[in-house]
């Protein structure tokens, strides 16, 4: 059984079924014979009595309020009265978004993982037997899955996967077609186990060297397991053979993270390897850090303020 | 979703030669900067090749004058040519972008047998 309305502040989207339920409905069957009254307060009106006569799109049951469907004059107070148990609801009835497949007011977030197990279920239990069909959209696109009864996204998340999904279930009341829609808001994050990574030290590290000297780059990194670190230089002037990359080094942190260091090594350096880039990056799936080393001949050092140098 | 495929690994002899090929699915292949990295047991993964979206390639020093990467941004695929294979190359094979990465695929091992 449908769970009762037991939210005393409600909003609603015009235009779609809506109901109320009481929560004492198991105490009113015991009680078949007390009387049981629904009443509306809004603005001037106090306490009116609601009946099928009221409206022809108000049905009343033994625990439930329906509307076929809710518009916006049905704002206001609802009371459900029956001996001395009394339950009351603040209904907010709001615009629907003609230009969209949802309302933004009415939409409910949710963050998953990425690579976390990330479900959607299009479910309407209270309207079950009602619905002729659903769909779920995506950003307002329909989404193409088996079941046209209870679709259904059942997946590990991926970032791509952030988005709108609205569940629309279409349904028939008296010869009357109607929708109801349920949106989520899907935020994927990153891995919260994972860090992105960091390269340690200044982004840009000029180096007093001296021509056929050797000197040795050192790129230390704070990043997971997955991750890689390395060098990049040369692009368009092809490789180079005093230029070597030693092994990579790591060191687990007490937090289950890793320090890597990587060497760049440049040999009986030359005019060439002067005033160039050498890149070292450290990428992950959650992003990049990037850092620069230059030669500079040792004589040029008064040319460059001192706070920009690696010695 | 990007998907990563690497395929063409296997056992062969010292001095043999292999051709890896890694599909990608699911992105701009031509607007990444691709490489091949590599893991050998107990080891970190390495970088093995890279090529830029222009074509340029550059390689690790121990596999200079061996190893040739290229791209087919037609048919979204890269490949590592491997000659005169060494038991040092053996390892699990990797493709993936430059920059930030895309979820690692399962890779191909490649044993070098002496």
């Known amino acids: 059984a449908e769970s009762c309305t037991s939210r005393p502040h409600i909003t609603v989207v015009e235009g779609e079924p809506f109901y109320l339920k009481h929560c004492s409905c198991s105490l009113a069957h015991e009680i078949e014979t007390t009387t049981k009254s629904w009443y509306k307060s809004s603005g001037s009106q106090e306490h009116v009595e609601l009946n099928p006569r009221s409206s022809s799109r108000i049905a009343l049951h033994d625990c439930v309020l329906e509307f076929w469907p809710v518009e916006l004059n049905d704002t206001g107070s609802y009371f459900f009265q029956m001996k001395n148990y009394t339950q009351k609801w603040k209904l907010n009835v709001i615009r629907r978004n003609k230009h969209s497949c949802f309302t933004e007011r009415q939409v409910t977030s949710k963050i998953v993982e990425v690579k976390k197990f990330f479900q959607i279920t299009c479910e309407n239990s209270y309207y079950q037997t009602l619905v002729n069909s659903t769909s779920l959209y995506k950003n307002c696109k329909k989404l193409l899955l088996e079941n046209n009864k209870n679709p259904t996204i059942k997946k590990n998340a991926e970032f791509e996967d952030q988005g709108y999904y609205s569940c629309v279930h279409f349904l028939h009341h008296n010869g009357k077609l109607f929708n109801i829609t349920k949106t989520f808001n899907i935020t994927i994050v990153e891995d919260r186990s994972n860090i992105v990574p960091v390269l340690l030290g200044p982004k840009l590290n000029h180096v007093a060297v001296e021509l056929g000297k050797n000197v040795r780059l050192n790129c230390s990194a704070l990043l997971n397991e997955e991750d890689v670190i390395y060098w990049m230089f040369g692009e368009e002037n092809g490789s180079d053979p005093n230029i070597h990359e030693e092994k990579e080094m790591r060191i687990m942190t007490p937090e289950g993270k890793w320090h890597a260091s990587k060497v760049l090594r440049i040999e009986n350096i030359g005019e060439s390897n002067l005033n160039v880039l050498y890149n070292c990056t450290v990428a992950s799936t959650g992003g990049t850090d990037t850092k620069s080393f230059i030669l500079v001949r040792k004589a040029d050092m008064a040319d460059i303020p001192g706070h920009v140098f690696t010695r | 979703e990007v998907q990563l495929v690497e395929s063409g690994g296997g056992l062969v002899q010292a001095g043999g030669s292999l051709r890896l090929s890694c599909a990608v699915s699911?992105?701009?292949?031509?607007?990444?900067?691709m490489a091949w990295f590599r893991q050998a047991q107990g080891k970190w993964r390495e970088l093995v090749a890279r090529?830029?979206?222009?074509?340029?390639?550059n390689y690790a020093d121990s596999v200079k004058g061996r190893f040739a990467i290229s791209r087919d941004n037609a048919k979204n695929t890269l490949y590592l040519q491997m000659n005169s294979l060494k038991p040092d190359d053996s390892a699990v094979y990797y493709c993936?972008?430059?920059?930030?990465?895309?979820?690692w695929g399962q890779g191909t091992q490649v044993t070098v047998s002496s």
């Open positions: 993936n972008k430059i920059g930030t990465l895309w979820y």
């Open positions: 699911g992105s701009t292949f031509s607007d990444a900067g």
């Open positions: 090529i830029s979206t222009s074509g340029i390639p």
